[in-house]
């Protein structure tokens, strides 16, 4: 079975995976589709890197734009470096500065909702 | 103002490449991912494939994924589409495109002028 | 992939008349879906997108509706400027499919 296939089998049971799944999906060729992307839980999304993501979308990735304002699109935006971001072509705008360190704060993210920045 | 300004016509005999450019003007050039279409004589547009031009990743038509291969140079705003093994079906006015990305996928609001390959030996 | 299955081909029409084509999605492409205008040695030209949103600078006499899998584009009175061949695009998919055009002469 390849990925497509494989995909097609578990899509309806992907709105409550965890990121460990996203990551291992994202090694197996799926091309999730992005309405079943922007069904994902947020903080299953946030995790991933832009890598990650790419491969976990494959073509699919291109409708990344339309979507960079609604979540989970939009707070995954927030938590890449903009150099990662640019990679993908899209013009995506929002992520964390170039020279920038970002701590990663748990009780200050789970109150405001974005990570703890330092400037350079 | 958005330019795509493509390669010139091109004769080919069949089994031979064919490489065509498609130069880029009026916009940032890494934000938006660029698209060839063709249409052959009497035929309809197909769309052929697509390149991310800031890190140079393709998708393909799976019609032509063995033929086919797309390149970026990011210097010069310049994609190029090369196709292989030529036959006469390839034939064709090949085209550029530009998505505009407002919604889903995006559709194309913007196309080179075209370049006309002829396939004939 | 999706298909896209236009209909007719072609299609011979008085001035002034009204002219309707048809696009039928392989599966629901959620109004994702574009209409040009292909005149012969020219790029195809951008009218509607979005099923029924006319691109700036497009006549008023050229629209377009439809939901699911079913899309309609309309010119409600054809002018001699309107030879063309013309053509659907579904981009609910990354990877594009154009419907097979559809060719439009004066009678």
């Known amino acids: 079975m390849n990925g497509s296939e494989y995909f097609v089998k578990i899509q309806s049971f992907l709105g409550g995976a965890p990121t460990e799944d996203l990551k291992a999906l994202s090694q197996q060729n799926v091309s999730m589709d992005l309405a079943t992307f922007m069904k994902l839980r947020t903080d299953a999304v946030l995790p991933l890197t832009v890598a990650e993501v790419q491969k976990l979308l494959g073509p699919h990735v291109e409708g990344l734009k339309a979507e960079e304002r609604h979540r989970p699109v939009r707070d995954w935006i927030l938590r890449q470096r903009q150099d990662d971001l640019d990679t993908l072509g899209l013009g995506l705008q929002g992520g964390i500065p170039n020279g920038y360190l970002v701590l990663d704060l748990s009780m200050q993210e789970a109150l405001s909702g974005t990570p703890c920045l330092l400037g350079p | 103002e958005v330019q795509l300004v493509q390669s010139g016509a091109e004769v080919k005999k069949p089994g031979a490449s064919v490489k065509v450019s498609c130069k880029a003007s009026?916009?940032?050039?890494?934000?938006?991912?660029m698209h060839w279409v063709r249409q052959a004589p009497g035929q309809g547009l197909e769309w052929m494939g697509n390149i991310n031009p800031s890190n140079g990743g393709p998708y393909y038509n799976e019609r032509f994924r063995s033929r086919v291969t797309m390149t970026v140079d990011k210097s010069t705003s310049t994609v190029y589409m090369e196709l292989s093994s030529l036959r006469s079906e390839d034939t064709a006015v090949y085209y550029c495109?530009?998505?505009?990305?407002?919604?889903?996928?995006?559709?194309?609001?913007?196309w080179g002028q075209g370049t006309t390959v002829t396939v004939s030996s | 992939d999706i298909q896209m299955t236009q209909s007719p081909s072609s299609l011979s029409a008085s001035v002034g008349d009204r002219v309707t084509i048809t696009c039928k999605a392989s599966q629901d492409i959620n109004k994702y879906i574009a209409w040009y205008q292909h005149k012969p040695g020219k790029a195809p030209k951008l009218l509607i997108h979005y099923t029924s949103e006319l691109q700036p600078g497009v006549p008023s006499r050229f629209s377009g509706s439809g939901s699911g899998r079913d899309y309609t584009f309309t010119i409600s009175s054809l002018q001699p400027e309107d030879i063309a061949t013309y053509y659907c695009l579904q981009y609910a998919n990354p990877l594009r499919t154009f419907g097979g055009g559809t060719k439009v002469e004066i009678k």
């Open positions: 495109a530009r998505p505009y990305y407002g919604s889903s996928y995006g559709y194309f609001d913007y």
């Open positions: 009026g916009y940032t050039f890494t934000n938006y991912w």
